[in-house]
């Protein structure tokens, strides 16, 4: 159980106040953490509290600001970056947010050492990704869909792709579906180690249908918003990976690197670009049905100016029991010697666990094991492999940092984190400088979130970046809820929950419950992390009890729990949130007639199901954007899970999961269904799907459509949704305003 | 050593068509992208179209888009240039060229194209 | 497009003598992209410099390329007599890739 912060004296109870749903609102108790904007091996830069940007160096103790905050101000700037000599930074303004990675801007660039912007061949604008060379101040950026390059920022720009075109051909950026689903970043360019190539991924969407939908806006007319979009089953992008020479690009132009044989034979995605060397870069790819990963390993020849793949040097990566990966599939971490590479794929337990590859799959050793996963390779050096796991303690919704000693044998492991600050922190990442001679530890609780630095031989701690005694000052008179994690073990099958209790709990009495669900493939909710959000208000405020419940298809606890969905999405899920409510019931705590459900996404999905279930649990529940039915929703995540929509594989599962198929078992309860009209990821046509389907057979329930906001429902719509979302519930709890 | 060999010059009337090969030796020909550059009787020399290695994108100056065509097999080391709706400005000697937009580091020794009636 | 401009039109020289083209262009051309040629009667050009500074293979040391920006030099240290020929400085930064009008190089 983890109290926070833990309350000693009663006297001090009566100064004390419960959250208000105001604090959430405004953000009252939001944390801060510090990731080093690192440089070197031992200097990083930060954008201090003024605006000032400033490099530290760890070694001599010193600091000096290399950029004012009056230079960031004369254009606005609310983002930047140095180029790797040091000679220019470029400054970003004007952002303007496309989907959940991309954004556009306008960017200038800054001459430091004469102090002044560079003037000519300024860049055009808006850009929609820009970038410094690792070396040099080389810069490549997209505009118009087509990739640029500057061998210096006052040089004229060389046009590397002419074939660019909205919504038709995307050229070092993401189309929409491989920016959310696959490679979950605004660009789709990678410069090699010392900046020789240029490595660009071109999609072609051409053939992909087009969900269109209305913005408003405040004109006459609403305009349409048009985003190629692969539903399940849908013709996909076509994609191709070129690698340019930026030193003489116009000589050769863009070589393209040849898609594995094994892969190229029907549909498949690029899932991922690593670059080992100058002149060795790492592929992968992945089948349309998403069981088989190809790693493919490619060497420049000098001789023929081309990149050559040898089968010899193609890994394949293949999953029996679901999907290939856990939510993505695993990147390679390459060693010193620029062939061999670690690797997280599932051993033969079904664990996720580093592995280390020198010629074959076949023939990888093991670095990791137990029933338990490795989470994250953060750096390999000589000596050392520094990864993230859940072993600690058998707690899967834990975080900490490990190192194992590779340059000796046999390899010995020691925790970094587990110890440190054993109550505050128990769910950590980690920021390497260069080489790894420093690194930050950034801890995100369950204690407040604490940021500190640490010398990368001896893992000492060095300084605190951030501690967040502000907010720890402001906390001092709240009544927060009380948090506890633990687990039901049930058919064999281990349920970890979180359950939020209000301050003053006591056991004797009832509460009513608010399962606030997630639920999605290779997810996890319940984690150790701090946090003050609306379920702490209702807990603090309103006395609700919240739980949070990790059932089968979430992550991080072996391929039994996680694969468990593949191929029955809406099945189980839904059976495990449903447990978990006959065991809170057990508990004797639970007051059975107020029982509620929330979900968004993914969650409203899972909510809007289990509140259909016909169980009588729910009195109501709330639906945030959910998916209504898996043919709505995006290819590749889709596929991957289910299979696609056709006869002879998955349709009939795809029409038995669907939300609309349960309407009739709506009557029982009081549902809320929320949907923003210019959602972009989860269509609003989902609930509009819904809505029909409960007219049809005449079931009454509550609905609310937010105009021209997207899946996150941001800006003064968040404020909206809370307020509304607290009423329905207080009212289906009955409890007063 | 890299050998390249126009053919398929003479002389054609105007608004005829005529098609251009260079045969490549030497080189890995499907990895390097190929040009047309010409010269006009007694004056300098003229980019008239690109084509990328696998031949999936080409490019053309503005005298010559929409009458031009730039292709290539690359299972035969061959780069081509069909040129229709031909005009008397069109008369020059042709050179295959090994390259992109530049620099051009083998050529090959022209074929002479003259538009006339 | 690029407009390259060369200059002299024609350079009058002995054998032996130092040979200063110029090449001037109407918008900043990154030195990466700047190459020269030269072309004898009846021959297809040959690479001489790329990079605006680069030798190509086989080009002897008498022959050099500086210059950035706009302005750019060829320099024939020392005229030797199968030097005379026509040079064409060439860009490759935008498309259309374009050439020089060209400096003819005649023995005096």
């Known amino acids: 159980i983890v109290l926070r912060p833990s309350r000693v004296h009663n006297s001090e109870e009566n100064t004390m106040r419960a959250l208000t749903l105001k604090d959430i609102l405004n953000g009252t108790f939001s944390y801060k953490t510090f990731f080093p904007n690192w440089i070197s091996g031992q200097e990083y830069l930060h954008q201090s509290a003024d605006n000032n940007i400033v490099l530290y160096n760890i070694e001599t103790g010193q600091s000096y600001t290399i950029l004012s905050n009056r230079t960031m101000k004369s254009v606005n700037a609310s983002n930047y970056g140095l180029s790797p000599d040091r000679q220019f930074v470029y400054l970003e303004s004007d952002y303007s947010k496309l989907w959940r990675y991309s954004y556009t801007a306008t960017y200038y660039i800054y001459d430091l050492s004469n102090g002044e912007f560079v003037r000519g061949n300024e860049l055009p604008r808006p850009i929609q990704y820009l970038c410094w060379s690792p070396v040099g101040s080389k810069l490549a950026y997209v505009y118009q869909n087509n990739i640029y390059l500057k061998q210096r920022p006052g040089d004229p720009p060389f046009q590397i792709t002419f074939n660019g075109r909205e919504n038709k051909i995307f050229n070092g950026i993401p189309d929409w579906v491989y920016e959310e689903e696959m490679l979950a970043t605004k660009y789709a360019l990678w410069w090699s180690p010392n900046g020789k190539f240029l490595a660009y991924a071109e999609f072609n969407d051409t053939d992909i249908p087009v969900i269109a939908y209305s913005y408003y806006g405040d004109e006459q007319y609403p305009r349409t918003i048009n985003i190629p979009y692969p539903k399940a089953g849908a013709k996909n992008p076509v994609v191709r990976i070129f690698i340019i020479d930026t030193t003489y690009p116009a000589y050769v132009g863009p070589q393209e690197v040849p898609v594995p044989a094994m892969i190229a034979s029907s549909d498949y995605y690029f899932s991922w670009l690593t670059w080992v060397t100058d002149e060795r870069v790492c592929l992968q790819w992945l089948k349309r049905v998403q069981n088989v990963s190809v790693l493919s390993i490619c060497d420049f020849r000098e001789d023929w100016q081309t990149w050559d793949c040898p089968k010899t040097q193609e890994h394949i990566e293949e999953s029996r029991t679901g999907w290939a990966g856990g939510f993505f599939v695993s990147t390679p971490v390459f060693s010193y010697d620029a062939i061999s590479y670690y690797k997280i794929f599932s051993d033969k337990d079904g664990y996720k666990h580093i592995h280390y590859i020198k010629d074959t799959v076949e023939n990888a050793i093991q670095i990791t094991s137990g029933k338990w996963e490795a989470i994250n390779i953060f750096r390999v050096t000589q000596d050392s492999l520094f990864y993230s796991s859940n072993e600690f303690e058998e707690y899967p919704g834990r975080r900490n940092i490990y190192r194992i000693s590779i340059g000796s044998y046999p390899p010995s492991k020691k925790c970094v984190t587990c110890h440190l600050r054993k109550e505050r922190c128990q769910y950590y990442t980690a920021s390497f400088s260069d080489y790894a001679k420093y690194y930050a530890l950034v801890c995100y609780g369950p204690g407040i979130p604490i940021s500190t630095l640490h010398d990368g031989r001896t893992d000492q701690e060095i300084k605190i970046l951030e501690e967040n005694k502000e907010l720890e000052n402001a906390l001092k008179n709240i009544q927060l809820p009380k948090e506890e994690i633990k687990k039901l073990e049930v058919d064999e099958i281990t349920l970890w929950y979180k359950m939020i209790l209000p301050p003053q709990f006591d056991r004797s009495k009832k509460y009513p419950l608010l399962i606030q669900v997630y639920g999605g493939p290779c997810s996890q909710s319940v984690r150790s992390v701090f946090a003050v959000n609306w379920i702490s208000y209702l807990a603090s405020k309103e006395g609700m009890v919240i739980a949070l419940v990790d059932g089968r298809g979430t992550a991080f606890q072996g391929d039994k729990l996680l694969y468990a969905v593949y191929r029955k999405l809406g099945v189980y899920e839904v059976e495990d949130q449903i447990t978990a409510v006959r065991k809170f019931i057990e508990m004797g705590f639970i007051d059975e007639k107020r029982i509620a459900i929330w979900g968004w996404s993914y969650g409203g999905y899972v909510s809007s199901l289990a509140l259909a279930s016909g169980t009588g649990l729910f009195k109501c529940g709330i639906a945030v954007a959910p998916v209504s039915s898996w043919e709505y929703y995006a290819s590749v995540y889709t596929e991957r899970f289910m299979g696609l929509p056709t006869k002879d594989d998955n349709l009939e599962h795809y029409k038995n999961s669907t939300v609309m198929a349960r309407a009739e078992y709506f009557r029982n309860v009081d549902y809320l269904l929320i949907h923003g009209t210019a959602d972009d990821n989860v269509h609003f046509q989902n609930s509009a799907q819904i809505a029909k389907a409960l007219v049809n057979a005449q079931v009454d329930f509550q609905a609310m459509w937010y105009s021209d906001q997207n899946h996150g429902l941001s800006g003064l719509s968040t404020n909206h949704l809370y307020t509304h979302m607290t009423h329905f519930l207080k009212q289906c709890f009955s409890l007063s305003d | 050593e890299v050998q390249l060999l126009e053919s398929g010059g003479g002389l054609v009337q105007p608004g005829g068509s005529l098609r251009l090969s260079c045969a490549a030796s030497g080189f890995t020909f499907s990895s390097y992208a190929m040009s047309w550059v010409r010269q006009a009787p007694g004056k300098g020399l003229e980019w008239v179209s690109a084509?990328?290695?696998?031949?999936?994108?080409?490019y053309y100056a503005d005298s010559v888009k929409g009458r031009f065509t730039i292709s290539r097999d690359n299972s035969k080391n061959t780069l081509y240039l069909q040129m229709n709706s031909l005009r008397a400005e069109d008369t020059a000697v042709y050179y295959c060229?090994?390259?992109?937009?530049?620099?051009?580091?083998?050529w090959g020794q022209g074929t002479l194209v003259t538009v006339s009636s | 497009e690029i407009v390259l401009t060369q200059s002299p039109g024609t350079l009058s020289l002995s054998p032996g003598e130092r040979a200063t083209l110029s090449c001037r262009a109407s918008q900043s051309v990154s030195s990466s992209y700047l190459a020269w040629y030269q072309q004898k009667p009846g021959q297809a050009p040959r690479l001489l410099i790329y990079g605006a500074s680069s030798r190509a293979t086989g080009i002897p040391d008498r022959f050099s390329g500086s210059g950035s920006g706009t302005d750019f030099t060829l320099t024939i240290s020392r005229l030797e007599p199968e030097d005379f020929a026509v040079y064409y400085c060439q860009q490759g930064l935008n498309i259309p890739s374009t050439f020089g009008q060209g400096t003819k190089v005649e023995i005096k």
């Open positions: 084509i990328s290695g696998s031949g999936g994108s080409t």
């Open positions: 060229a090994k390259g992109w937009l530049g620099p051009f580091d083998y």
